[in-house]
Interface confidence: medium
């Protein structure tokens, strides 16, 4: 039975050219996290595997950095980065949990960054 819940940074905004941290946190479960996948819409950005560490998709290597924790840092943001991002937690024995973050990249210099938190 899947008892866990995913907390995310929710809807966030950032400035064009800047960077942003995408964070998810899985709670209320004792399941072992075996892998976390980060996706933009349906494109794979990065994988953090419990054993093999991080794998960044080649097409995003220049603009995506692993961490902090199981989170993901997007750099050199463009307006085209606006959209949905998903953290997909593969766990054992629970199964798969998915969290959603909406990022809006603004031209303006007054973009407010959404609340961030670190994974303990």
């Amino acid at each position: 039975m899947m008892t866990g819940t995913i907390e995310t940074t929710g809807n966030i905004s950032a400035e064009k050219g800047g960077s942003i941290i995408l964070q998810c946190h899985l709670s209320s479960t004792t399941a072992q996290v075996t892998q976390v996948n980060w996706e933009q819409q349906d494109q794979l950005l990065a994988i953090c595997n419990a054993d093999l560490g991080w794998h960044i998709s080649p097409s995003f290597k220049d603009r995506v950095a692993p961490g902090p924790g199981l989170g993901l840092t997007l750099q050199s943001l463009t307006v085209n980065d606006t959209g949905e991002y998903f953290c997909i937690y593969h766990t054992y024995p629970d199964g798969t949990y998915t969290g959603r973050i909406f990022l809006e990249v603004l031209e303006s210099s007054v973009a407010e960054h959404g609340a961030r938190f670190q994974i303990p």
Epitope: N49, D51, L52, H90
Partner: antibody, heavy 120, light 107 residues
């Protein structure tokens, strides 16, 4: 050349044991998650087990849980499947396969298979 | 467990035909869907991963599409070497289940 070569199949009586081996060449086994997949005569493919990259996490189909054990010997670059308490329904060709990236990805390299027949 | 249902079970086609095979998941698997080709007596071969990405060395006449629960494998112009059985597989959640297979036969 990247290759997988299975061995160890054969005829065994119900309740018996068998250990399958899968020798890898052209890549380092410990850098990848690995899997076993089986195919009963004239039937489709059935995932059996996956071993994570470090060898620290194992996953099994319900049909083999508690009877089969997946493991690896890094020094021999070889993957194993120890099969105990074998049943007639375990009769199949057993393939070992490499997992592309992380543990939740496609099986990109397959061995030629080894036939296990469980019969009295 | 996530069930994968392929259709049709089998089909007859001629060289040059456009062939479409579908795969449906019992729940959303996003794009965690792979396609394999298997010829008699041989091991399966990966054709497409993550629903639409062609594995290196696979001819461009093969293509995949879909997301969520419904997926399609298309062979744009069937060649003699394409007569085989095709399987879909989900790797969204363990156990990593396969579809029942679709046998493509010569008409």
């Amino acid at each position: 050349e990247v290759q997988l070569l299975e061995s160890g199949g054969g005829l065994v009586q119900p309740g018996g044991s068998l250990r399958l081996s899968c020798a890898a060449s052209g890549f380092t086994l410990s850098s990848y998650a690995m899997a076993w997949v089986r195919q009963a005569p004239g039937k489709g493919l059935e995932w059996v087990s996956t071993l994570s990259g470090s060898g620290g996490s194992t996953y099994y189909a319900d049909s083999v849980k508690g009877r089969f054990t997946i493991s690896r010997d890094n020094s021999k670059n070889t993957l194993y499947l120890q099969m105990n308490s074998l049943r007639a329904e375990d009769t199949a060709v057993y393939y070992c396969a490499r997992v592309r990236v992380g543990a939740y990805d496609a099986f990109d390299i397959w061995g030629q298979g080894t036939l296990v027949t469980v019969s009295s | 467990d996530i069930q994968m249902t392929q259709s049709p079970y089998s089909l007859s086609a001629s060289v040059g035909d456009r062939v479409t095979i579908t795969c449906r998941a019992s729940q959303s698997i996003r794009r965690y869907l792979n396609w394999y080709q298997q010829k008699p007596g041989k091991a399966p071969k990966l054709l497409i991963y993550r629903a639409s990405t062609l594995q290196t060395g696979v001819p461009s006449r093969f293509s995949g599409s879909g997301s969520g629960t419904d997926f399609t494998l298309t062979i744009s112009s069937l060649q003699p070497e394409d007569f085989a059985t095709y399987y879909c597989q989900q790797t969204y959640s363990s156990p990593f289940t396969f579809g029942g297979g679709t046998k493509v036969e010569i008409k």
